[in-house]
C-alpha cells in the first residue's frame, strides 16, 4: 500500500484500530518511556507493574496470536514537508507481561531526539496501543524503512515496515573537480547525482554552453579531448523534481612558472653566499627544482656563468667555492614539468675578504742567551687583494723537554716582521710556526722551525724557513 503526499493528512483522521469505545480517554506517554503499560481502567487480577503469574507453556500456546495492525506501507513526499505515521496493536487481557513500543529505522533503534508519542486505550478486553511518529521538514537522510517493536510475554513482535521516500532535486554525491592539465591533452571529469526520484540525467556545461545535446544517465564521465586555454566546467543534474547545477570548476592549462619575485642575500663569507628567494606563480604545476646562476660582476658580459641546481624547496641555497673579496651577479630560475621560468633580474652580492693563502717566509729563530729570549724574524707573505688587509701574525711556540710539554701562542701587530719570546724551559726543544692574519681570518702556519735550548751554556739553533730535523745534534 503506497501513500502519496496528498494523502498524508488522512493518516490520523480515520477510525482508531481495534475495539475502542468512543468514551474512553487515552493515556499518552512519550516514546522514550519504556516502562510497563499503565493499568487498564477495568480491573485486573494483578497491576501491570507487578510480575504476573507464569503462564504454563501449555497455556501460552493457547493464547491468541498478537501482531501489529496493518498500516501504510510506503510514504512518498518532497523534501522539507512534514510527515506522520503510526503503528498500532491490540493486546488482550490474557497477556500479562508487556513492554513499551520502540521505533526502529533500517535496523537501528531510534533513540533520543525523535518526536514520538505512544497512546494507550484500555477496555474490558485488553488495551489498544498506538505509537505515533512524526518528522518535521523531512530531509534525504530521513529516507528509509521504519518499523515498531515490542515484547509481549517475552516474545518480540515486529511491525510491517513503513518505507519513507523523500523526493527532491538531484543531490550530487560526486561533483567535477578542478584539475590542472597539459595543453591539448585529454582528461576526464566525473559527475554523479542521485534522487529520489530516479532517474537522474546529466548535462555537461563548458564556459556556460552545454557540451552534450542528449542527457546521460548519472553517473556521467565527460572525456575532454584537450584544451588550449583555461575553461570552466559544471554539470546539470535533472530529475522529475527539477534541476540542480554543480559547482563550476576551473580547468587550468599548465604553463612554465613565473620567475622568482624576490631574491635576497642572507649572508656572505669569503668563499660563499647564502641566497634565498620567493618563487613566482608555479604555472599550475609543482616546482621541481631551481637554478642559481652566478657570474663575476666585474668581468665583461662574456664572462662564464656558473650554474648551481638545487631542489625547489627550501627556497635557500649556499653558493660555495667563490673567490674572496669578489663581486658577483646572481639570478634564479625554477622549473616545473612544462619547463624553466625566465631568469629573475640579476642582483649583486659580494664575498668578504678571505684569510691569507700563504704562510710567512724565511723564518729564523735565535736564542739571545744574555736576555734569555728567543729572537724570531720572518718576511711578509705575498698577500693577494682578496686575502684582505694584513692585521698581524700569530706565533705558535711549543716547548718540549723530558718531562714537560708546553704549547703557547702570541699575536703581534702587522708592524715589522720580528718578535721576541721569553725562554720558557731550558734543556728543551722549541718549535716555532707563524701564520699571517687578515680581517678574513688566519692563514696557514709556516713549516715548523726547531731550536734546542741548552741548560745554560751552549746554543744550537736552526735559523731556517724550511723544516728542521727533530734532532739538531751533528
Amino acid at each position: 500500500e503506497k501513500w502519496e503526499e496528498t494523502e498524508l493528512d488522512q493518516l490520523f483522521s480515520g477510525p482508531l484500530p481495534g475495539r475502542l469505545p468512543v468514551n474512553h480517554r487515552p493515556f499518552s506517554a512519550p516514546h522514550s518511556s519504556r516502562d510497563q503499560l499503565p493499568p487498564p481502567q477495568t480491573g485486573r487480577s494483578h497491576p501491570a507493574h507487578t510480575a504476573a503469574p507464569q503462564v504454563t507453556s501449555t497455556a501460552s500456546k493457547l493464547l491468541p496470536p498478537v501482531a501489529f495492525n496493518h498500516t501504510i506501507g510506503h510514504i512518498v513526499l518532497s523534501e522539507h514537508k512534514n510527515v506522520k505515521f503510526n503503528c498500532s496493536i491490540n493486546i488482550p487481557n490474557t497477556y500479562q507481561e508487556t513492554a513499551g513500543i520502540s521505533w526502529w529505522k533500517d535496523g537501528k533503534e531510534l533513540l533520543g531526539a525523535h518526536h514520538s508519542i505512544t497512546q494507550f486505550y484500555p477496555d474490558e478486553e485488553g488495551v489498544s496501543i498506538i505509537a505515533l511518529f512524526s518528522i518535521a521538514s523531512v530531509q534525504r537522510s530521513d529516507n528509509g524503512s521504519y518499523f515498531c517493536k515490542m515484547k509481549v510475554n517475552n516474545r518480540e513482535i515486529v511491525s510491517d515496515p513503513i518505507y519513507v521516500e523523500v523526493q527532491g532535486l538531484p543531490y550530487f554525491i560526486k561533483q567535477p573537480e578542478s584539475v590542472n592539465v597539459t595543453r591539448n591533452t585529454a582528461f576526464n571529469l566525473t559527475c554523479q547525482a542521485v534522487g529520489p526520484p530516479e532517474p537522474v540525467n546529466i548535462f555537461w556545461v563548458q564556459n556556460s554552453s552545454r557540451v552534450n545535446e542528449k542527457p546521460e544517465r548519472s553517473p556521467s564521465v565527460l572525456t575532454v579531448p584537450g584544451l588550449t586555454e583555461t575553461a570552466v566546467f559544471s554539470c546539470e543534474a535533472h530529475n522529475d523534481k527539477g534541476l540542480t547545477v554543480s559547482k563550476g570548476v576551473h580547468i587550468n592549462i599548465k604553463v612554465i612558472p613565473s620567475p622568482p619575485t624576490e631574491v635576497h642575500i642572507l649572508n656572505s663569507t669569503a668563499h660563499s653566499i647564502l641566497v634565498s628567494w620567493v618563487p613566482g606563480f608555479d604555472g599550475y604545476s609543482p616546482l621541481q627544482n631551481c637554478s642559481i646562476q652566478v657570474k663575476e660582476a666585474d668581468r665583461l658580459s662574456n664572462g662564464s656563468v656558473m650554474v648551481f641546481n638545487t631542489s625547489a624547496s627550501p627556497h635557500l641555497y649556499e653558493i660555495q667555492q667563490l673567490q674572496a673579496l669578489a663581486n658577483y651577479s646572481i639570478a634564479v630560475s625554477c622549473r616545473n614539468e612544462i619547463g624553466w621560468s625566465a631568469v629573475s633580474p640579476w642582483i649583486l652580492a659580494s664575498t668578504t675578504e678571505g684569510a691569507p693563502s700563504v704562510a710567512p717566509l724565511n723564518i729564523t729563530v735565535f736564542l739571545n742567551e744574555s736576555n734569555n729570549i728567543l729572537d724570531i724574524r720572518w718576511t711578509k707573505p705575498p698577500i693577494k687583494r682578496q686575502d684582505g688587509e694584513l692585521v698581524g701574525y700569530r706565533i705558535s711556540h711549543v716547548w718540549e723537554s723530558a718531562g714537560t710539554y708546553k704549547e703557547l701562542s702570541e699575536e703581534v701587530s702587522q708592524n715589522g716582521s720580528w718578535a721576541q719570546i721569553p725562554v720558557q724551559i731550558h734543556n728543551a726543544t722549541c718549535t716555532v710556526r707563524i701564520a699571517a692574519i687578515t680581517k678574513g681570518g688566519i692563514g696557514p702556519f709556516s713549516e715548523p722551525v726547531n731550536i734546542i735550548i741548552p741548560e745554560h751554556s751552549k746554543v744550537d739553533y736552526a735559523p731556517s724557513s724550511t723544516p728542521a730535523p727533530g734532532n739538531t745534534d751533528s
Partner: antibody, heavy 119, light 112 residues
C-alpha cells in the same frame, strides 16, 4: 589581476589612520608590495616596501611616520600621526621583483585612496 | 640621498613626432640598470612602461623605448599619439643608504 585601496577619508591632524590594500588574481604570499603617495598636483613619492621574506623597508623621510604591515590577505599602511602635509592620494602597488628591500619595478597599481588631513 | 632629476618639467611634441625625456640619477642606480619609466594620465594611477632601463613592459607599444646606464637615462616616444599626453616619471632602485627607491619629479608631455 587587480589592487584596491580603501580607508581614505578626512581626518584631523594627529588622528591615526590605517589604509588597507586588498588584491585579487594573485597571491600576497608571492609578491612584495609598496605604498606610493601623490599630493594634489604634485609628483610621486615612494613610502616603503613590505616583502614576503624580509622586514619592511621605508624611505628615510617616512620612517616613524608610517607603518607598513601585511596579513595573508591585505597590506596595511598606518599613518601614525597625520599632518596636513600628508594630504594625498595613496597608491598600493605590486612590486614585480625585489631584492633586500630594493624594488625592481612597480607593475600593478591600484586606483588610489584619498586622505585629507584638515582641522 | 638618492635623487632622480628630470630636468624638463614639460616638453611638447606634434602628433607623429618624437619626444625625448631625460633622467639623471645620483648615485648610480642598482646594478646600473634598475631604472623604470611610468606614464600617468590625469585622474589615473601611473602605468609601468619600461623597466631595467630598456625593457618594454607587457602591452606597451614598441614606439616607447628606453636607454641609458648608471646615472644617465632616456625615454623616447616616437610617432607620438594624442592619447600619450601625460606626465612621465622615472624611478630607480638603489643599494646604497636606506632610500632603496625614488621617483623623478616628472615630465609633462604636451601633444599638439
Amino acid at each position: 589581476q587587480s589592487v584596491e585601496e580603501s580607508g581614505g577619508r578626512l581626518v584631523t591632524p594627529g588622528t591615526p589612520l590605517t589604509l588597507t590594500c586588498t588584491v585579487s588574481g594573485f597571491s600576497l604570499s608571492t609578491y612584495s608590495m609598496s605604498w606610493v603617495r601623490q599630493a594634489p598636483g604634485k609628483g610621486l613619492e615612494w613610502l616603503g616596501i613590505v616583502s614576503v621574506a624580509i622586514d619592511p623597508v621605508y624611505a628615510t623621510w617616512a620612517r616613524g611616520r608610517f607603518t607598513i604591515s601585511r596579513t595573508s590577505t591585505t597590506v596595511n599602511l598606518k599613518i601614525t600621526s597625520p599632518t596636513t602635509e600628508d594630504t594625498a592620494t595613496y597608491f598600493c602597488v605590486r612590486v614585480a621583483f625585489s631584492t633586500n628591500g630594493i624594488p625592481h619595478r612597480l607593475d600593478l597599481w591600484g586606483q588610489g585612496t584619498l586622505v585629507t588631513v584638515s582641522s | 640621498a638618492q635623487v632622480l632629476t628630470q630636468t624638463a618639467s614639460s616638453v611638447s611634441a606634434a602628433v607623429g613626432g618624437t619626444v625625448t625625456i631625460s633622467c639623471q640619477s645620483s648615485p648610480s642606480v642598482y646594478n646600473h640598470n634598475w631604472l623604470s619609466w611610468y606614464q600617468q594620465k590625469p585622474g589615473q594611477p601611473p602605468k609601468l612602461l619600461i623597466y631595467e632601463a630598456s625593457k618594454l613592459a607587457s602591452g606597451v607599444p614598441s614606439r616607447f623605448s628606453g636607454s641609458g646606464s648608471g646615472t644617465q637615462f632616456t625615454l623616447t616616444i616616437s610617432d607620438v599619439q594624442c592619447d600619450e599626453a601625460a606626465t612621465y616619471y622615472c624611478a630607480g632602485g638603489f643599494s646604497s643608504g636606506s632610500d632603496s627607491f625614488a621617483f623623478g619629479g616628472g615630465t609633462e608631455v604636451v601633444v599638439t
